[in-house]
Every structure is written in C-alpha cells, then in structure tokens.
Interface confidence: low
C-alpha cells in the first residue's frame, strides 16, 4: 500500500496592484512570504480530505491559496467554489512538486466562503478544503495611550483601550533633540505596560495593533533647560487624564519642587515626587502633577517652582471637542521647471491629526513635525514638478480640515492640433496661459505671415485636468481659407510654439509642428 502524497497548504498575501475576481492560476504574482496553513487530515471523513487552517482576509486584500503536492507522476485538479467549477492548472516547481494556486484579487464579501480543491494523482484522489472569511476590521480601534499612576507604587501604567488588544511599549531616551529619533541608539524600547524608571529625558508610550501605531509623550518641564521662547501649551479634552512632569537636577539634595495652578498650590493627591542620585552624584527630582479626569476649571497656567532653579510654566487648555486650526484658503504657486519647492501647511491641532496629500486621485504619505511654538507643520515636496491641484486633508476624532493648492509650472507652450470639415482647433498647456495667433500660408505669404482674425474663437482654460488648465483656439472654416495651409501659434513670456494645418476636404489631416523659442 503506497504512502499518501504529502500535502502542504500555504497562504500568500500580496501587495495590491491589480483588480479582478478570484481566478485559478499556475503562476501566482510576486508576493510576501508564504504562511503555512497546516492542512491536516480531516478526522472521520470518508476518503482523503485535508482541511487548511481558516483564512481571514482584509477587504480589498489580495491572496493566493496554494497547495504543494509531493506526489509521484502527473496530477490533475479542479477547484469548486459555491457549486461552480473553476479551471485549475497545476505546474511543477524546481523540487518537482505539483503546485496548484487560486488567486483571489481584491477580496470582497462575494469571494468569501469554502474553496474545495479536488486533486487526482496517479496513486490517490483527495480533497482540500479552504475556508476564507473577511476580517471584521469595522470593530477594530486604536486609541491613543494615556497614563495612570500605579496603585501604591511610584510607577506609571500605560493604557490604550484598543481592539484587538494592542502591544504597548515605552520608548525612552536620555539624549536631547535629534538623537531621540526612533532608530537612534539612544532610544530604548520596553515592551511592557508599567514603567518605574521615570527620570529619563524623553518618555513616550506607544500602542500598536493591526490599525497602526499611536504614541503619547509624557509632557515635561525641565528646569535645567532654557525655557522655550513661547510658553509650552498642552491641550486636553474634558474627561481625559492630565499628566505633567517637572524635572530638576541639582548638585545636592537641598532643593524642593512645587506645582501651582494659577498661583494656588495643587491639592494633595494631585501630585507625587520621586528622586534619585545620578551617576555623577547629582540629585534628580521629578514632581508629577496629575488629574485623573480633567474638567473645564483645570484650564490655566501650571507653574513648577524650585528653591534652586528659575520656575517655568505651561498653559493647559481643556477643550470640549478636538480641533484643527489652520488657514484653509486655497494657495496658488507658480514655479520654474527645475525650481525646488515644497507645499507646507502650518496647523495647531488636538488630538494629533492623521493626514494625507493627494494629487491626481493618488494619495501620498503625510509627515508632520512639531514646532517650538505649539504649531505643527506638514510639508509635501514630492510633486515631481507636475502642475495641477494638490489637496492636504487632515482629520482627528473630532475635526476635519482640507486645504487646496494649485501648482503652475512656468513653461513655453506645446501645441496640439485637431481638424474637422468645419473647423481647426489648437490646444496648449503652457503656463502662463498662452495667447493665440492664426496665420495663412499662401503664394502671397509663403512664410505664413498673413494674419487671420475672422472666425477665430479662443477659449482660455476650457479643460481642467487634475487642476491643470488647458487653453484652446478654434478657427471656423471659410471659403477664403479652404485648401490652404494655416498656422496656429501659442505664445507666452517663455516662448512660442506653432502647428501648421492643411485645411482640405474632410478626412485625416496632416500636422507639421514648428517650435519657435
């Protein structure tokens, strides 16, 4: 009795770049690394039935279900999905294994269900069952982490109420500025919820799940640092927890820290202090001000004072709803073909925004950078000197913001011509928008200098292609010019371009392009 062929079932996730219905394929597209689906023999089943692990797929994701058969000789196969037979073309890989693939492009609800694969080898017949379902990401959430004090301990707990359960990590850094970027050796990440070492320069907590990654920085006033030119500002929504850390280093322990809100000392239970000696035997003290759930009356200037350092303040503003403050008036820019240029939007927002830049229905990633004055900035430089309309869109839990930009690239006109039995038309996309002249070429005017003014109709910006204006000029046919060559010329401050058209009987028209700078 011959051994059963060895079956391997794999799932391949693809980067989406196509759209189609599920199809059987002998050569699946280039992809991510395969995931083994197990393919165990189904107990108590008549015949040889293998069952793959259930497959959950995101809407619009593309996958390949693939079976590798370590069977001697040729194999034939058939896919069945929702009682319909689908074509199946096995091929053999370099290890001489039979490979059968089912590609599902752009997953939809209709493509979810049971996929049955029947394989016939020289030795055995067997069935493989795949169950494909759509992952319910509608229930998924990713909330910004917040801090809580750990009961009876000098430690902070980082909490993110997200679905699925997020991985929470602390991101710690003891350097200043640029060296605290994520990839720097100065950055330490701790994949745990509780943090005891609260003396670092920069402390953030991040939560990540299938939807991405959200981080919250522990707002800190450092009395040993020169204060910012503008007062640091912290926004919170009603009901959110407030945490501010005041930090100070001194040569010895003979100093104390206090918090005041609008010149009144914070109540007991709204602060706690920690201290430690640093490696050079100086004393580090930190004093936390915290409110477990803020109300409107927690708004104001929070001042940290020390007996040995100048005091520093932060303005805490409690808002009912999140906001995005920026000027939404549209902006037009005119640049040369090789000029370096970036669009930029300066905004103040709470909570932090998610944003995109869009051009020609294509979205681009959006980076934002915090400025010292409480504002943030997002720049977009990847326009590749393509003229048109660019859109910046930002949103947070409570607000949305859209700003339009128009980019014009200064260049001399390029002319395209069309002709019909009754008229000739010329189009140009140069910028600034060109002006037009029509000239007749005749025996009297072999250089085409005889200007035509009758029957000319100019339309400026008659067609908008993703914000790119196109100018056109149309010449209506008259007996006086039928059968002649005419020349349309578009000119602007950067040059002139012309096209010559033969106005004869209807049919295809030859065009001769002239470029005149």
């Amino acid at each position: 009795n011959q051994d059963l062929p060895v079956i391997k079932c794999v799932l391949i996730n693809h980067k989406n770049n196509d759209s189609s219905v599920g199809k059987s394929s002998s050569y699946p597209m280039v992809s991510e690394s395969p995931e083994d689906l197990g393919c165990a023999l189904r107990p108590q089943s008549s015949g040889t039935v293998y069952e793959a692990a259930a497959v959950e797929v995101d809407v619009s994701a593309s996958i390949t279900l693939q079976v590798l058969v370590d069977a001697p000789g040729n194999i034939s196969c058939l896919w069945v999905f929702k009682h319909s037979s689908l074509n199946c073309q096995p091929h053999f890989d370099l290890q001489n294994r039979g490979v059968v693939s089912m590609v599902i492009l752009k997953m939809t609800e209709t493509q979810a269900g049971e996929y049955l694969l029947f394989i016939q080898s020289e030795a055995t017949n067997y069935t493989i069952l795949f169950t494909v379902s759509i992952r319910n990401t509608l229930l998924y959430t990713l909330r910004r982490p917040y801090f809580r004090k750990m009961e009876n301990q000098d430690a902070l707990v980082c909490i993110s109420e997200s679905v699925p359960e997020p991985i929470v990590e602390w991101v710690l850094c003891d350097s200043q500025g640029e060296s605290c970027k994520e990839e720097s050796p100065a950055v330490v990440k701790k994949e745990e919820k509780v943090l005891h070492e609260l003396f670092g320069t920069d402390i953030r907590c991040c939560a990540r799940n299938e939807l991405g990654r959200e981080c919250t920085r522990l707002f800190t006033i450092d009395l040993n640092q020169t204060p910012q030119t503008t007062l640091p500002q912290l926004f919170l929504k009603v009901g959110e927890p407030l945490w501010i850390r005041c930090k100070a280093v001194h040569v010895n322990h003979g100093f104390g820290l206090t918090w005041e809100l609008e010149n009144k000392a914070l109540e007991e239970g709204n602060y706690f202090e920690m201290s430690t000696y640093s490696t050079n035997r100086t004393m580090i003290r930190i004093l936390f001000a915290f409110v477990s759930s803020v109300a409107r009356n927690d708004t104001g200037y929070y001042t940290c004072s020390s007996s040995k350092h100048p005091s520093q303040s932060a303005l805490v503003t409690i808002v009912e709803k999140g906001f995005i403050n920026a000027t939404n008036s549209s902006e037009d820019y005119e640049i040369d073909q090789y000029e370096e240029f970036c669009f930029s939007v300066r905004f103040k927002a709470y909570p932090q925004i998610r944003c995109t830049w869009t051009f020609s229905r294509k979205s681009f990633p959006c980076e934002q950078k915090g400025l010292d004055n409480g504002y943030s900035i997002s720049k977009f430089c990847n326009h590749k000197h393509q003229p048109g309309e660019y859109i910046f869109h930002a949103e947070n839990d409570d607000a949305q913001f859209t700003k339009m930009f128009t980019l014009n690239i200064r260049r001399k006109p390029q002319v395209l011509a069309e002709a019909s039995a009754s008229q000739a038309s010329c189009f140009s996309d140069g910028y600034p928008l060109p002006s037009w002249t029509w000239k007749k070429c005749s025996d009297k005017s072999p250089n085409c200098t005889e200007e035509i003014t009758e029957g000319v109709w100019n339309r400026k910006a008659n067609r908008k292609v993703f914000g790119q204006w196109v100018s056109s000029s149309t010449l209506n046919m008259s007996e006086a010019i039928k059968g002649f060559l005419v020349k349309c010329c578009a000119y602007n401050s950067l040059g002139t371009s012309c096209e010559t058209i033969l106005l004869n009987s209807p049919g295809p028209f030859p065009f001769i392009q002239d470029n005149i700078s």
């Epitope: 710690l172 994520e182 990839e183 720097s184 950055v187 330490v188 990440k189 701790k190 994949e191």
Partner: antibody, heavy 120, light 107 residues
Framework: QVQLVQSGAEVKKPGASVKVSCKAS????????MHWVRQAPGQGLEWMGR????????SYAQSFQGRVTMTRDTSTSTVYMELSSLRSEDTAVYYC?????????????WGQGTLVTVSS | DIQMTQSPSSLSASVGDRVTITCRAS??????LGWYQQKPGKAPKLLIY???SLQSGVPSRFSGSGSGTDFTLTISSLQPEDFATYYC?????????FGQGTKVEIK
C-alpha cells in the same frame, strides 16, 4: 559606566559544548537586547543571534540554528551563549554586544571577547 | 539573508588623506546601517549608526552617508590612530549581517 564582562578563555574537544557568560552592569539590563558575534582568527565578524533579556525571546542566525542556545539570568544581569557539537571551525573569539532598542540597531557596547579553541 | 559587500577589502593611505569605504546591501535596508572600527586584539567600536549619525565621543572626521543599498564611510583626514579594520553591519532584518571588512594600512 556600562560594562560587559565575559568569562575566560576555553579549550574544548570537537563534539563538546561550550557555555560563555556575559555579565552586564552600569545600565538597566532588561532594556537592551544582547547580541552575540564571533570572529574566527584573521577573519571578519559573524552575527550569531540575540536575546531579549526582558522576556527571554531569542533569534538565531540560520547557520547556528539547532547548535546555539542563548539564555539570561535577570537576577545577576548575565546572559549565556551555549554552542554545542563543536568543530575546529568554531575556534573564534566570541563577543557579547549590547544593542539599544527592541528592533535591532547599532551595537554600542561590546564585551572584551572570549577565545574558544576547539582542538583534539 | 541580506548580503553586505564592502570595498575595497584593503587600502593603503597616508596620514592626512581622505579615505572612503563603501558598503553595498543586496536589498534595500533604508538607513539601518552601522560602521565599526576594530584594532587587532580589541573588540569593535561603533563609529556611525543609522547610516549617518555620529556616535558620541567619535571624532568628527568620521562621517557616514547613504540609504537604501549604497553606503559610504568617509574619514576626512586620516590620523595615525585610524589605521584599523572597518566593518559595516545592517540591522534592517535578522540575521544582522556584517560586511567582510576593509583594512586601512599605512602607505
């Protein structure tokens, strides 16, 4: 200051195992990955694997899979690297090395190295 | 595995020379690259991390550049203490492979 102190030189016979220790001090032991890198005489550096001292999870280079085991003892801030089924080509200096951050990155501190000689 | 190819494998230079060592990755590693200096009988020492960031305490004559697959370590004016072997290492994905090394010798 940060220090990684490794155990002394070892001479082993082919087929035997060796266990090298690396004691860390001067920083929070569980906050940094510990990598192991070896260097055969006159040769370049070869990455062997890493351990996360916080949770104990490991990742090994394919060429050492099945022969290397990395462990840690948080009570003594020490990591261990055990290499089994030794062959003469395993003669090398073995370094433990500290890497900030959970996702790799550059090695900012190295141990002094432990010479392991495999000879019959 | 990602292969790291360093060139040249050795070079001779004089004090004051500008020296450039290149490192090429077999696939895109963004800027996840470190440069190390090793002297005989000693452990390597980190010079550059994240392709271009200078490790604290390292002289500013050392600089790194590049991203993606091509990277460069430059020593603007070679000093007597710089004669050593230099290695690049990618930390983009496990295993974190090293280049084969470039030995900088006195001319």
């Amino acid at each position: 200051q940060v220090q990684l102190v490794q155990s002394g030189a070892e001479v082993k016979k082919p087929g035997a195992s060796v266990k090298v220790s690396c004691k860390a001090s001067g920083y929070t032991f569980t906050s940094y990955y510990m990598h192991w890198v070896r260097q055969a005489p006159g040769q370049g550096l070869e990455w062997m694997g890493r351990i996360n001292p916080s949770g104990g999870s490991t990742s090994y280079a394919q060429s050492f899979q099945g022969r290397v085991t990395m462990t840690r003892d948080t009570s003594t801030s020490t990591v261990y690297m055990e290499l089994s089924s030794l062959r003469s080509e395993d003669t090398a200096v073995y370094y433990c090395a500290r890497v900030p951050g959970l996702y790799g990155g550059a090695i900012d501190y190295w141990g002094q190295g432990t010479l392991v000689t495999v000879s019959s | 595995d990602i292969q790291m190819t360093q060139s040249p494998s050795s070079l001779s230079a004089s004090v004051g020379d500008r020296v450039t060592i290149t490192c090429r990755a077999s696939q895109d590693i963004r800027n996840d690259l470190g440069w190390y200096q090793q002297k005989p009988g000693k452990a390597p020492k980190l010079l550059i991390y994240a392709a271009s960031s200078l490790q604290s305490g390292v002289p500013s004559r050392f600089s790194g550049s590049g991203s993606g697959t091509d990277f460069t370590l430059t020593i603007s004016s070679l000093q007597p203490e710089d004669f050593a072997t230099y290695y690049c290492q990618q930390s983009y994905s496990s295993p974190f492979t090293f280049g084969q090394g470039t030995k900088v010798e006195i001319k």
